[in-house]
């Protein structure tokens, strides 16, 4: 049976969802264990400049020593103010100095990146050493690059569409996810549903998605259900500032009791089916409905509190 609930975009003051993901439009990860230099290449596209970017490089000591030297090739299409964190990492940074401005002196070796097209930048980087990772990101707000983490099964890095960078790279898009909402016809009361649908990724290893839910309501004002649907290999770690009904696929646990796993349910994997689930749980309002790529952290901020739904 069709559920009558006309999903419409919700204004950011009513609900906003940001997320961190390893999914990239194009990318690759490879193992180059004997390389003198660990080479990483980032192609960053910004729709409008100038943009701000936070770029963090993390490395763990291996056998008590810092990792080998790292070359990070940063290719951008417009002006960027860069906040770089790479403490203790022997980093060489290749970038276009006319486009990248540091918020504070980088304290690393820098090289001018020739103004080549993408293919030649990859060739230029590869001349210097085997590429461990390469990725294309659209309008990132922050990037975390983990060094010495490459889990790639390939011995070489060939850019391919729609890749999961695993632990090597996580990033947060500047643009929040599209949040939609609707009224479920024929349901009385003020119970609201927050539905988060995580789409399958490009590698099917077990994943935990941390879901932070911040609802700006007085504790007694809320009657809500959180519906989390994702592929079978996803489990959920929920960090919520309110008590609410939880309805998930896979398993879930709460941040306050992370070791206590609770078995979820088999949920439909279509928007219509999830709206039907919300209706079955007696929700009268879908305060937020969000579809996301496979993410590691999702933050939902909402201020609906069972009040009137406002769409933009």
């Amino acid at each position: 049976e069709t559920v009558h609930c006309d999903l419409q975009p919700v204004g950011p003051e009513r609900g906003e969802v940001t997320y961190t993901t390893s999914q990239v439009s194009k990318g690759c990860v490879a193992q180059a264990p004997n390389a003198i230099l660990e080479v990483h290449v980032l192609f960053l596209e910004f729709p409008t400049g100038p943009s701000q970017l936070e770029l963090t490089l993390q490395a763990s000591k291996q056998n008590g020593t810092w990792p080998r030297e790292v070359l990070l090739v940063l290719s951008v299409n417009s002006s960027v103010f860069l906040h770089l964190q790479a403490l203790g990492i022997p980093l060489h940074l290749a970038y276009n100095s006319s486009l990248v401005t540091f918020q504070e002196p980088p304290g690393v070796n820098t090289t001018e990146l020739p103004s080549f097209p993408k293919t030649q930048i990859l060739e230029w980087a590869a001349e210097r050493g085997p590429i461990t990772s390469a990725a294309e990101l659209n309008d990132p707000q922050s990037i975390l690059l983990r060094l010495g983490q490459a889990q790639g099964s390939l011995s070489f890095c060939m850019l391919e569409a729609s890749q999961d960078m695993g632990r090597t790279l996580e990033w947060r898009p500047r643009t929040p996810a599209l949040v939609r909402g609707c009224h479920l016809e024929g349901v009385a009361g003020h119970k609201e549903a927050h539905i988060l649908r995580v789409l399958p990724g490009h590698s099917a290893g077990p994943r935990t998605v941390t879901v932070k839910v911040e609802l700006s309501c007085a504790p007694g004002d809320l009657d809500a259900v959180l519906i989390l649907q994702g592929p079978p290999y996803v489990s959920w770690l929920i960090d919520a500032n309110h008590n609410m009904q939880i309805w998930t696929t896979g398993e879930y646990s709460f941040k306050i009791f992370p070791e206590k796993n609770i078995r979820g349910f088999k949920l439909p994997d279509t928007p219509q089916g999830l709206l039907g689930e919300a209706r079955m749980l007696n929700a009268s309002i879908v305060a937020s409905f969000v579809e996301l790529p496979l993410a590691s952290i999702v933050s939902l901020h909402a201020s609906s509190c069972g009040g009137r739904l406002q769409t933009s």
Partner: antibody, heavy 120, light 106 residues
Framework: EVQLEQSGPEVVKPGTSVKISCKTS????????LHWIKQNQGKSLEWIGG????????TYRQKFKDKATLTVDKSSSTAFMELRSLTSDDSAVYFC?????????????WGQGTTLTVSS | ENVLTQSPAIMSASLGEKVTMTCRAS?????VYWYQQKSDASPKLWIY???NLAPGVPARFSGSGSGNSYSLTISSMEGEDAATYYC?????????FGGGTKLEIK
């Protein structure tokens, strides 16, 4: 299957020009640059230059800047090399080769070669 | 330009014999690449990043070296290995090849 098919042998007179071609197939041309290498009778290899199919950007070895002009026709996935003011020193086999960043930017596929003979 | 000198220019080896040829760079390079060329054929990528075998290259081949001195080794010569081998560098412009080592069967 990746293929680089070069035009046939050429016999030309000194002082003239010649344009040889390299038709590519089996891969996305904008993801690789295409290069030209000269092999003279003494069998040594000499890199001439390369071209990017994406924007037609070229890089040349200094000594070939006035000798060779590299161009591409994206619609037919074909690269061209024109050699001008030919002398007997230009008699050689010319190869086109694709560059692969994932193999260290080495030349992973080569054309079969075009033999150029400059003779009066 | 960075001149690559290969030695010996010509060598012969018996089947089953271990073969080593060298490539010396006039300026230090980070990696060398090796190509195999048989008579009247195009060169083939054989070894990249000094020691990585290209797809289809038999495991009896290996490459090593650093700085100015690099080598290609065949652990046990086979008939199909008779060819000319060229080393190449990319790190200094222009890209240069060595003069080649011609390997014949004794």
């Amino acid at each position: 299957e990746v293929q680089l098919e070069q035009s046939g042998p050429e016999v030309v007179k000194p002082g003239t020009s010649v344009k040889i071609s390299c038709k590519t197939s089996g891969y996305t041309i904008t993801e690789h640059t295409l290069h030209w290498i000269k092999q003279n009778q003494g069998k040594s290899l000499e890199w001439i230059g390369g071209i990017n199919f994406d924007n037609g950007g070229t890089t040349y070895r200094q000594k070939f800047k006035d000798k060779a002009t590299l161009t591409v026709d994206k619609s037919s996935s074909t690269a061209f090399m024109e050699l001008r003011s030919l002398t007997s020193d230009d008699s050689a086999v010319y190869f086109c080769a694709r560059r692969a960043y994932y193999y260290g930017s080495a030349f992973d596929y080569w054309g079969q070669g075009t033999t150029l003979t400059v003779s009066s | 330009e960075n001149v690559l000198t290969q030695s010996p220019a010509i060598m012969s080896a018996s089947l089953g014999e271990k073969v080593t040829m060298t490539c010396r760079a006039s300026s230090s390079v980070n990696y060398v690449y090796w190509y195999q060329q048989k008579s009247d054929a195009s060169p083939k990528l054989w070894i990249y990043y000094t020691s990585n075998l290209a797809p289809g290259v038999p495991a009896r081949f290996s490459g090593s070296g650093s700085g100015n001195s690099y080598s290609l080794t065949i652990s046990s010569m086979e008939g199909e290995d008779a060819a000319t081998y060229y080393c190449q560098q990319f790190i200094s412009f222009p890209y240069t090849f060595g003069g080649g080592t011609k390997l014949e069967i004794k």
